[in-house]
Protein backbone atom coordinates (compact mmCIF):
# COMPACT_ATOMS: atom_id res chain seq x y z
CA UNK A 1 0.00 0.00 0.00
CA UNK A 2 1.26 3.51 -0.75
CA UNK A 3 2.25 5.72 2.16
CA UNK A 4 2.17 9.44 2.80
CA UNK A 5 5.72 10.79 2.94
CA UNK A 6 7.34 14.19 3.24
CA UNK A 7 10.80 15.68 2.93
CA UNK A 8 12.16 17.56 5.93
CA UNK A 9 15.12 18.57 8.03
CA UNK A 10 15.30 18.17 11.79
CA UNK A 11 17.06 20.38 14.32
CA UNK A 12 17.35 19.69 18.01
CA UNK A 13 15.99 22.15 20.56
CA UNK A 14 19.41 23.84 20.73
CA UNK A 15 19.15 24.43 16.97
CA UNK A 16 21.85 21.91 16.10
CA UNK A 17 21.48 20.43 12.63
CA UNK A 18 21.96 16.77 11.72
CA UNK A 19 24.65 15.82 9.21
CA UNK A 20 26.24 12.61 7.96
CA UNK A 21 29.31 11.43 9.83
CA UNK A 22 30.69 8.60 7.76
CA UNK A 23 28.42 6.27 5.79
CA UNK A 24 26.27 4.98 8.68
CA UNK A 25 26.21 7.66 11.37
CA UNK A 26 24.61 11.03 11.99
CA UNK A 27 26.04 13.78 14.16
CA UNK A 28 24.58 17.04 15.49
CA UNK A 29 26.27 20.41 15.22
CA UNK A 30 25.49 24.08 14.73
CA UNK A 31 25.51 25.14 11.09
CA UNK A 32 25.19 28.57 9.53
CA UNK A 33 24.91 30.07 6.08
CA UNK A 34 25.96 27.87 3.19
CA UNK A 35 26.99 25.10 5.58
CA UNK A 36 23.26 24.48 6.14
CA UNK A 37 23.32 22.61 2.83
CA UNK A 38 25.23 19.83 4.61
CA UNK A 39 22.24 18.94 6.78
CA UNK A 40 20.55 15.63 6.15
CA UNK A 41 17.19 15.66 4.38
CA UNK A 42 14.85 13.02 5.78
CA UNK A 43 12.02 11.29 4.01
CA UNK A 44 9.52 10.87 6.83
CA UNK A 45 6.77 8.35 6.12
CA UNK A 46 3.48 7.68 7.89
CA UNK A 47 3.45 3.95 8.69
CA UNK A 48 1.43 1.41 10.63
CA UNK A 49 1.94 1.27 14.39
CA UNK A 50 0.33 0.56 17.74
CA UNK A 51 -2.98 2.27 18.50
CA UNK A 52 -2.45 5.37 20.60
CA UNK A 53 -4.12 8.72 21.26
CA UNK A 54 -1.06 10.93 21.01
CA UNK A 55 1.64 9.07 19.07
CA UNK A 56 1.96 8.96 15.29
CA UNK A 57 4.07 6.12 13.84
CA UNK A 58 6.68 7.21 11.30
CA UNK A 59 9.77 5.88 9.56
CA UNK A 60 12.78 8.12 8.98
CA UNK A 61 14.67 7.48 5.77
CA UNK A 62 17.42 9.57 4.24
CA UNK A 63 16.10 11.21 1.11
CA UNK A 64 17.24 9.52 -2.10
CA UNK A 65 19.37 7.08 -0.14
CA UNK A 66 18.37 3.51 0.72
CA UNK A 67 19.09 4.16 4.41
CA UNK A 68 16.63 4.20 7.31
CA UNK A 69 17.11 4.92 10.97
CA UNK A 70 16.53 1.71 12.90
CA UNK A 71 16.71 0.55 16.51
CA UNK A 72 18.47 -2.68 17.43
CA UNK A 73 20.10 -4.28 20.44
CA UNK A 74 23.88 -4.02 20.42
CA UNK A 75 25.70 -5.47 23.42
CA UNK A 76 22.31 -5.68 25.15
CA UNK A 77 21.69 -1.93 24.71
CA UNK A 78 19.07 -0.31 22.44
CA UNK A 79 21.08 1.40 19.71
CA UNK A 80 20.29 3.74 16.84
CA UNK A 81 21.76 2.85 13.49
CA UNK A 82 21.42 3.63 9.80
CA UNK A 83 20.39 0.49 7.97
CA UNK A 84 20.47 -0.20 4.24
CA UNK A 85 17.25 -1.44 2.64
CA UNK A 86 16.13 -2.54 -0.81
CA UNK A 87 14.78 0.70 -2.33
CA UNK A 88 12.25 -1.29 -4.39
CA UNK A 89 10.43 -2.31 -1.19
CA UNK A 90 10.68 0.83 0.96
CA UNK A 91 8.97 2.83 2.26
CA UNK A 92 5.96 0.63 2.93
CA UNK A 93 2.94 0.91 5.21
CA UNK A 94 3.92 -2.09 7.34
CA UNK A 95 7.51 -1.29 8.21
CA UNK A 96 9.42 -3.69 10.45
CA UNK A 97 9.20 -2.52 14.04
CA UNK A 98 12.87 -1.58 14.30
CA UNK A 99 12.25 1.15 11.70
CA UNK A 100 9.20 2.63 13.44
CA UNK A 101 9.32 5.70 15.67
CA UNK A 102 6.39 7.13 17.57
CA UNK A 103 6.32 10.83 16.76
CA UNK A 104 5.09 12.79 19.76
CA UNK A 105 4.25 16.42 19.03
CA UNK A 106 3.86 18.91 21.88
CA UNK A 107 3.91 22.69 21.33
CA UNK A 108 5.61 22.36 17.94
CA UNK A 109 8.38 20.23 19.44
CA UNK A 110 8.80 16.65 18.21
CA UNK A 111 10.06 13.61 20.04
CA UNK A 112 10.80 10.31 18.32
CA UNK A 113 10.30 7.30 20.57
CA UNK A 114 11.48 3.91 19.37
CA UNK A 115 8.52 1.58 18.80
CA UNK A 116 10.82 -1.37 19.39
CA UNK A 117 12.15 0.04 22.68
CA UNK A 118 9.49 2.14 24.47
CA UNK A 119 10.85 5.14 26.40
CA UNK A 120 14.01 5.24 24.29
CA UNK A 121 14.27 8.36 22.13
CA UNK A 122 16.31 9.74 19.27
CA UNK A 123 18.72 11.98 21.16
CA UNK A 124 21.59 14.41 20.75
CA UNK A 125 24.28 15.46 23.20
CA UNK A 126 24.70 18.97 24.57
CA UNK A 127 28.21 18.88 23.12
CA UNK A 128 28.93 19.83 19.52
CA UNK A 129 29.74 17.31 16.78
CA UNK A 130 28.62 14.23 18.70
CA UNK A 131 26.70 11.24 17.25
CA UNK A 132 22.92 11.13 17.21
CA UNK A 133 21.96 8.21 19.42
CA UNK A 134 19.12 6.35 21.13
CA UNK A 135 18.77 7.57 24.70
CA UNK A 136 16.80 6.07 27.56
CA UNK A 137 16.20 9.30 29.51
CA UNK A 138 14.00 12.30 28.82
CA UNK A 139 14.38 15.67 30.49
CA UNK A 140 17.99 15.07 31.48
CA UNK A 141 21.22 16.37 29.97
CA UNK A 142 20.63 14.82 26.57
CA UNK A 143 18.29 16.47 24.07
CA UNK A 144 15.21 14.62 22.83
CA UNK A 145 13.20 17.57 21.40
CA UNK A 146 13.39 18.49 17.73
CA UNK A 147 11.82 20.92 15.32
CA UNK A 148 10.93 20.01 11.75
CA UNK A 149 11.07 22.10 8.60
CA UNK A 150 9.76 21.02 5.21
CA UNK A 151 12.33 21.00 2.42
CA UNK A 152 11.31 22.51 -0.89
CA UNK A 153 12.78 20.58 -3.79
Amino acid sequence: APVRSLNCTLRDSQQKSLVMSGPYELKALHLQGQDMEQQVVFSMSFVQGEESNDKIPVALGLKEKNLYLSCVLKDDKPTLQLESVDPKNYPKKKMEKRFVFNKIEINNKLEFESAQFPNWYISTSQAENMPVFLGGTKGGQDITDFTMQFVSS
Epitope: A1, P2, V3, R4, S5, L6, N7, C8, M44, F46, Q48, E51, S52, N53, D54, I56, V58, K93, K103, E105, N108, T147, M148, Q149, F150, V151, S152, S153
Partner: antibody, heavy 119, light 108 residues
Protein backbone atom coordinates in the same frame (compact mmCIF):
# COMPACT_ATOMS: atom_id res chain seq x y z
CA UNK B 1 -3.92 33.45 16.61
CA UNK B 2 -4.30 30.95 13.77
CA UNK B 3 -6.09 32.48 10.76
CA UNK B 4 -6.77 31.16 7.26
CA UNK B 5 -8.36 33.32 4.57
CA UNK B 6 -9.37 31.94 1.17
CA UNK B 7 -9.78 34.08 -1.93
CA UNK B 8 -10.07 33.75 -5.69
CA UNK B 9 -13.53 32.21 -5.97
CA UNK B 10 -16.08 33.41 -8.48
CA UNK B 11 -18.01 32.54 -11.61
CA UNK B 12 -16.19 30.52 -14.28
CA UNK B 13 -17.39 28.89 -17.48
CA UNK B 14 -17.32 25.12 -17.97
CA UNK B 15 -13.90 24.07 -19.25
CA UNK B 16 -12.28 27.10 -17.64
CA UNK B 17 -9.61 27.37 -14.98
CA UNK B 18 -9.35 29.09 -11.62
CA UNK B 19 -6.67 29.47 -8.97
CA UNK B 20 -7.74 29.77 -5.35
CA UNK B 21 -5.48 31.20 -2.65
CA UNK B 22 -5.37 30.68 1.10
CA UNK B 23 -3.31 33.13 3.11
CA UNK B 24 -2.39 31.99 6.61
CA UNK B 25 -1.12 33.73 9.73
CA UNK B 26 -0.25 32.61 13.24
CA UNK B 27 1.76 29.63 11.99
CA UNK B 28 4.18 28.72 9.22
CA UNK B 29 3.57 26.69 6.08
CA UNK B 30 7.14 25.43 6.49
CA UNK B 31 6.07 23.10 9.29
CA UNK B 32 2.33 22.45 8.86
CA UNK B 33 0.57 20.42 6.18
CA UNK B 34 -2.45 21.95 4.48
CA UNK B 35 -5.52 20.44 2.84
CA UNK B 36 -8.21 21.69 0.51
CA UNK B 37 -11.77 20.50 1.17
CA UNK B 38 -14.90 21.40 -0.78
CA UNK B 39 -18.63 21.33 -0.19
CA UNK B 40 -21.19 21.41 -3.00
CA UNK B 41 -24.46 23.23 -2.22
CA UNK B 42 -26.51 21.14 0.22
CA UNK B 43 -23.94 18.34 0.16
CA UNK B 44 -21.25 16.94 2.45
CA UNK B 45 -17.54 17.62 2.85
CA UNK B 46 -15.23 16.28 0.15
CA UNK B 47 -11.46 16.11 0.65
CA UNK B 48 -9.43 17.25 -2.36
CA UNK B 49 -5.83 16.82 -1.31
CA UNK B 50 -2.98 17.71 1.02
CA UNK B 51 0.48 19.26 0.69
CA UNK B 52 3.47 18.75 2.98
CA UNK B 53 6.64 19.99 1.28
CA UNK B 54 6.29 21.21 -2.29
CA UNK B 55 7.18 17.78 -3.68
CA UNK B 56 4.86 15.82 -1.40
CA UNK B 57 1.23 16.24 -2.39
CA UNK B 58 -1.57 13.68 -2.17
CA UNK B 59 -4.98 13.81 -3.82
CA UNK B 60 -8.35 12.13 -3.76
CA UNK B 61 -8.54 9.83 -6.78
CA UNK B 62 -11.21 11.97 -8.46
CA UNK B 63 -9.06 15.12 -8.14
CA UNK B 64 -5.85 13.78 -9.70
CA UNK B 65 -5.01 15.46 -12.99
CA UNK B 66 -7.39 18.41 -12.82
CA UNK B 67 -6.49 19.84 -9.40
CA UNK B 68 -3.02 20.90 -8.25
CA UNK B 69 -2.06 22.07 -4.77
CA UNK B 70 1.01 24.24 -4.28
CA UNK B 71 2.30 26.80 -1.81
CA UNK B 72 4.63 29.75 -1.44
CA UNK B 73 6.04 29.53 2.06
CA UNK B 74 7.64 32.99 1.84
CA UNK B 75 4.18 34.48 1.22
CA UNK B 76 2.41 32.19 3.72
CA UNK B 77 0.06 31.29 0.89
CA UNK B 78 -1.47 28.01 -0.25
CA UNK B 79 -2.93 27.57 -3.73
CA UNK B 80 -5.42 25.33 -5.51
CA UNK B 81 -5.20 25.33 -9.30
CA UNK B 82 -8.38 23.94 -10.86
CA UNK B 83 -8.54 23.11 -14.58
CA UNK B 84 -11.20 21.80 -16.99
CA UNK B 85 -13.89 22.90 -14.56
CA UNK B 86 -17.35 21.30 -14.68
CA UNK B 87 -20.73 22.23 -13.27
CA UNK B 88 -20.27 19.63 -10.53
CA UNK B 89 -17.20 21.52 -9.26
CA UNK B 90 -19.53 24.26 -8.04
CA UNK B 91 -18.89 24.39 -4.30
CA UNK B 92 -17.51 26.28 -1.34
CA UNK B 93 -13.77 25.57 -1.14
CA UNK B 94 -12.08 25.52 2.26
CA UNK B 95 -8.41 25.40 3.16
CA UNK B 96 -7.58 23.63 6.41
CA UNK B 97 -4.52 23.00 8.57
CA UNK B 98 -3.51 19.49 9.60
CA UNK B 99 -3.36 19.47 13.42
CA UNK B 100 -0.08 17.54 13.52
CA UNK B 101 2.10 16.04 10.82
CA UNK B 102 0.31 12.90 9.53
CA UNK B 103 -2.54 13.25 12.05
CA UNK B 104 -4.93 13.70 9.13
CA UNK B 105 -7.40 15.73 11.18
CA UNK B 106 -7.81 19.47 10.67
CA UNK B 107 -7.87 21.93 13.54
CA UNK B 108 -7.92 25.23 11.64
CA UNK B 109 -10.21 26.19 8.77
CA UNK B 110 -10.80 29.18 6.55
CA UNK B 111 -14.24 30.65 6.02
CA UNK B 112 -14.42 29.28 2.48
CA UNK B 113 -14.58 30.81 -0.99
CA UNK B 114 -17.41 30.06 -3.42
CA UNK B 115 -16.76 28.75 -6.93
CA UNK B 116 -19.62 28.66 -9.42
CA UNK B 117 -19.14 26.85 -12.73
CA UNK B 118 -21.84 27.88 -15.15
CA UNK B 119 -22.30 29.20 -18.66
CA UNK C 1 -10.07 3.85 -1.35
CA UNK C 2 -11.68 3.51 2.05
CA UNK C 3 -15.36 4.51 2.15
CA UNK C 4 -16.89 6.01 5.29
CA UNK C 5 -20.60 5.45 5.90
CA UNK C 6 -22.51 7.36 8.57
CA UNK C 7 -25.89 6.53 10.04
CA UNK C 8 -28.42 7.87 10.35
CA UNK C 9 -28.33 10.53 7.63
CA UNK C 10 -30.76 12.67 9.59
CA UNK C 11 -31.69 12.53 13.23
CA UNK C 12 -34.38 14.41 15.15
CA UNK C 13 -33.87 14.90 18.86
CA UNK C 14 -34.77 17.17 21.75
CA UNK C 15 -32.69 19.20 24.17
CA UNK C 16 -31.48 16.89 26.95
CA UNK C 17 -31.56 13.76 24.79
CA UNK C 18 -28.65 11.35 24.52
CA UNK C 19 -27.67 11.13 20.86
CA UNK C 20 -25.52 8.48 19.13
CA UNK C 21 -24.18 8.75 15.58
CA UNK C 22 -22.31 5.85 14.02
CA UNK C 23 -19.64 5.70 11.37
CA UNK C 24 -18.44 2.60 9.54
CA UNK C 25 -15.25 2.26 7.51
CA UNK C 26 -15.11 -0.13 4.57
CA UNK C 27 -11.95 -1.65 6.12
CA UNK C 28 -10.06 -1.33 9.39
CA UNK C 29 -8.55 2.08 10.12
CA UNK C 30 -7.46 1.27 13.70
CA UNK C 31 -8.35 4.44 15.64
CA UNK C 32 -7.61 6.90 12.84
CA UNK C 33 -10.98 8.61 12.95
CA UNK C 34 -12.07 12.19 13.61
CA UNK C 35 -15.44 13.87 14.11
CA UNK C 36 -16.44 17.39 13.02
CA UNK C 37 -19.41 19.64 13.67
CA UNK C 38 -20.59 22.05 11.00
CA UNK C 39 -23.25 24.74 11.21
CA UNK C 40 -24.89 26.30 8.11
CA UNK C 41 -22.65 28.80 6.35
CA UNK C 42 -19.71 28.04 8.64
CA UNK C 43 -16.51 26.04 8.43
CA UNK C 44 -16.35 22.62 10.11
CA UNK C 45 -15.01 22.42 13.66
CA UNK C 46 -12.85 19.55 14.91
CA UNK C 47 -14.55 17.78 17.85
CA UNK C 48 -12.70 14.50 18.34
CA UNK C 49 -9.56 12.91 16.95
CA UNK C 50 -8.01 9.45 17.16
CA UNK C 51 -11.54 8.12 17.74
CA UNK C 52 -11.83 9.25 21.36
CA UNK C 53 -9.66 12.30 22.16
CA UNK C 54 -11.58 15.53 22.68
CA UNK C 55 -10.18 18.49 20.73
CA UNK C 56 -9.26 21.63 22.60
CA UNK C 57 -12.26 23.59 23.93
CA UNK C 58 -14.86 20.92 23.09
CA UNK C 59 -17.45 20.33 25.86
CA UNK C 60 -17.22 17.03 27.73
CA UNK C 61 -20.77 16.04 26.73
CA UNK C 62 -19.21 14.96 23.42
CA UNK C 63 -17.42 11.62 23.40
CA UNK C 64 -16.13 9.23 20.78
CA UNK C 65 -15.45 5.53 20.84
CA UNK C 66 -14.61 2.62 18.56
CA UNK C 67 -11.69 1.04 16.77
CA UNK C 68 -11.15 -0.93 13.60
CA UNK C 69 -14.14 -0.22 11.36
CA UNK C 70 -16.98 0.78 13.76
CA UNK C 71 -17.11 4.14 15.53
CA UNK C 72 -19.63 6.20 17.47
CA UNK C 73 -20.04 9.84 18.43
CA UNK C 74 -22.17 10.36 21.54
CA UNK C 75 -23.68 13.58 22.85
CA UNK C 76 -24.67 12.78 26.42
CA UNK C 77 -27.21 15.58 26.91
CA UNK C 78 -28.11 17.56 23.83
CA UNK C 79 -27.85 21.36 24.11
CA UNK C 80 -29.47 23.96 21.82
CA UNK C 81 -26.05 24.78 20.35
CA UNK C 82 -25.54 21.17 19.23
CA UNK C 83 -28.05 21.16 16.37
CA UNK C 84 -25.77 20.92 13.35
CA UNK C 85 -24.37 18.45 10.84
CA UNK C 86 -21.73 15.97 12.02
CA UNK C 87 -19.09 14.33 9.86
CA UNK C 88 -16.68 11.48 10.53
CA UNK C 89 -13.35 11.39 8.76
CA UNK C 90 -10.83 8.64 8.10
CA UNK C 91 -7.45 10.21 8.83
CA UNK C 92 -5.04 7.32 8.52
CA UNK C 93 -6.17 4.54 6.23
CA UNK C 94 -3.92 4.82 3.21
CA UNK C 95 -2.92 7.94 1.30
CA UNK C 96 -6.42 9.37 1.00
CA UNK C 97 -8.39 11.20 3.69
CA UNK C 98 -12.15 10.60 3.38
CA UNK C 99 -15.24 12.06 5.04
CA UNK C 100 -18.52 10.35 5.77
CA UNK C 101 -21.62 11.74 4.07
CA UNK C 102 -22.76 13.55 7.22
CA UNK C 103 -25.53 13.28 9.81
CA UNK C 104 -27.90 16.22 10.15
CA UNK C 105 -29.14 16.67 13.71
CA UNK C 106 -32.44 18.58 13.85
CA UNK C 107 -34.93 19.67 16.51
CA UNK C 108 -37.70 17.15 17.15
Amino acid sequence: EVQLVESGGGLVQPGGSLRLSCTVSGFSLSSYAMSWVRQAPGKGLEWIGIIYDSASTYYASWAKGRFTISKDTSKNTLYLQMNSLRAEDTAVYFCARERQIFSGDMDGWGQGTTVTVSS
Amino acid sequence: EIVMTQSPSTLSASVGDRVIITCQASQSIDNWLSWYQQKPGKAPKLLIYRASTLASGVPSRFSGSGSGAEFTLTISSLQPDDFATYYCQNTGGGVSIAFGQGTKLTVK
